[in-house]
Interface confidence: low
């Protein structure tokens, strides 16, 4: 299953990056799972994941750095709290969980660049 | 003449970006001219230029946004005062001016990404 996502995104100076993950659904899925993976060097780690019912809101865990909304076959993902050390390739993985058959699609990754802001001067 | 420069550089949150421009000199040049060009969309504009004698300091115009140092066939370039709208491809052009023969080399460009910082809160 094909998954499309932008090649490059710049995080805001507040450490927030948003991108769209779009999948070409071969069937009429009602339950979809979206996972964001981060690849840096040769290490791949899971950043966040959410399962949602089509037409409903994405719900990430309360302590997740991700939030998102869905619209049809598009998922709008936002990752917050990013620092320069979090710069890396963020891969969108989409699974069509229900009804069968199960489909898996993995995007090519969005390179997110993050720059740490300068601290504000102390107010006297 | 081959000119090498990094593919991507992130400007600091203060709007400062530095990169090295290295050229493979076919001869023993004593006078070298370095020009930084910015390409955005299909427009190419000159950002700054400096001519220097090998072993001496690079001298840009007083109001230039560029500064630099040279060491052998390497030029360390710093561009300051960058804003998000200045994001673009910065191309290093090197000319060996003296003695003859004249050589021209153009790098593949360094994509400089610039993110505007959030304003600091007013101090009461």
């Amino acid at each position: 299953m094909h998954v499309a996502q932008p090649a490059v995104v710049l995080a805001s100076s507040r450490g927030i990056a948003s991108f769209v993950c779009e999948y070409a659904s071969p069937g009429k899925a009602t339950e979809v799972r979206v996972t964001v993976l981060r690849q840096a060097d040769s290490q791949v780690t899971e950043v966040c994941a959410a399962t949602y019912m089509m037409g409903n809101e994405l719900t990430f865990l309360d302590d997740s750095i991700c939030t998102g909304t869905s619209s049809g076959n598009q998922v709008n993902l936002t990752i917050q709290g990013l620092r320069a050390m979090d710069t890396g390739l963020y891969i969108c993985k989409v699974e069509l969980m229900y009804p069968p058959p199960y489909y898996l699609g993995i995007g090519n990754g969005t390179q997110i660049y993050v720059i740490d802001p300068e601290p504000c001067p102390d107010s006297d | 003449m081959h000119v090498a420069q990094p593919a991507v550089v992130l400007a600091s949150s203060r709007g400062i970006a530095s990169f090295v421009c290295e050229y493979a000199s076919p001869g023993k040049a004593t006078e070298v001219r370095v020009t930084v060009l910015r390409q955005a969309d299909s427009q190419v504009t000159e950002v700054c230029a400096a001519t220097y004698m090998m072993g001496n300091e690079l001298t840009f115009l007083d109001d230039s946004i560029c500064t630099g140092t040279s060491s052998g066939n390497q030029v360390n370039l710093t561009i300051q005062g960058l804003r998000a709208m200045d994001t673009g491809l910065y191309i290093c052009k090197v000319e060996l001016m003296y003695p003859p023969p004249y050589y021209l080399g153009i790098g593949n460009g360094t994509q400089i990404y610039v993110i505007d910082p959030e304003p600091c809160p007013d101090s009461d």
Partner: nanobody, 125 residues
């Protein structure tokens, strides 16, 4: 480290054909841009053709449209440039380049971070 190795250059008469190959190794991103450039001494490198794997988007310089075809064999990780109806003005050193950047525009394609050593093409009249 990315390695790019061009081959297939040579000498040919005007009207003839050549097929250039560029073998790539050591690249970790699955979405990337690959392009062919050419350069004659002391002139700026010119993009001839490019392809973006994220959507198969291709680009051709006006001077080669209808004569040159760019293609990519993902299984072999090899880029090709089929050059037909060659002209003397096609004489140049041909380079292939690769990057994680998109290549939907000239601005994007110039982000290409990795270059091969080049293969010489000479077309005589």
């Amino acid at each position: 480290q990315v390695q790019l190795q061009e081959s297939g250059g040579g000498s040919v008469q005007a009207g003839g054909s050549l097929r250039l190959s560029c073998a790539a190794s050591g690249y970790t991103y699955s979405t990337y841009c690959m392009a062919w450039f050419r350069q004659v001494p002391e002139k700026e490198r010119e993009r001839v053709a490019s392809i973006y794997t994220g959507g198969g988007t291709t680009y051709y310089a006006d001077s080669v449209k209808g004569r040159f075809t760019i293609s990519l064999d993902n299984a072999k990780n090899t880029l090709y440039l089929q050059m037909n109806s060659l002209k003397p003005e096609d004489t140049a050193m041909y380079y292939c380049a690769k990057s994680a950047a998109r290549c939907d525009s000239s601005r994007d394609v110039n982000r290409l971070g990795y270059w091969g050593q080049g293969t010489q093409v000479t077309v005589s009249s």
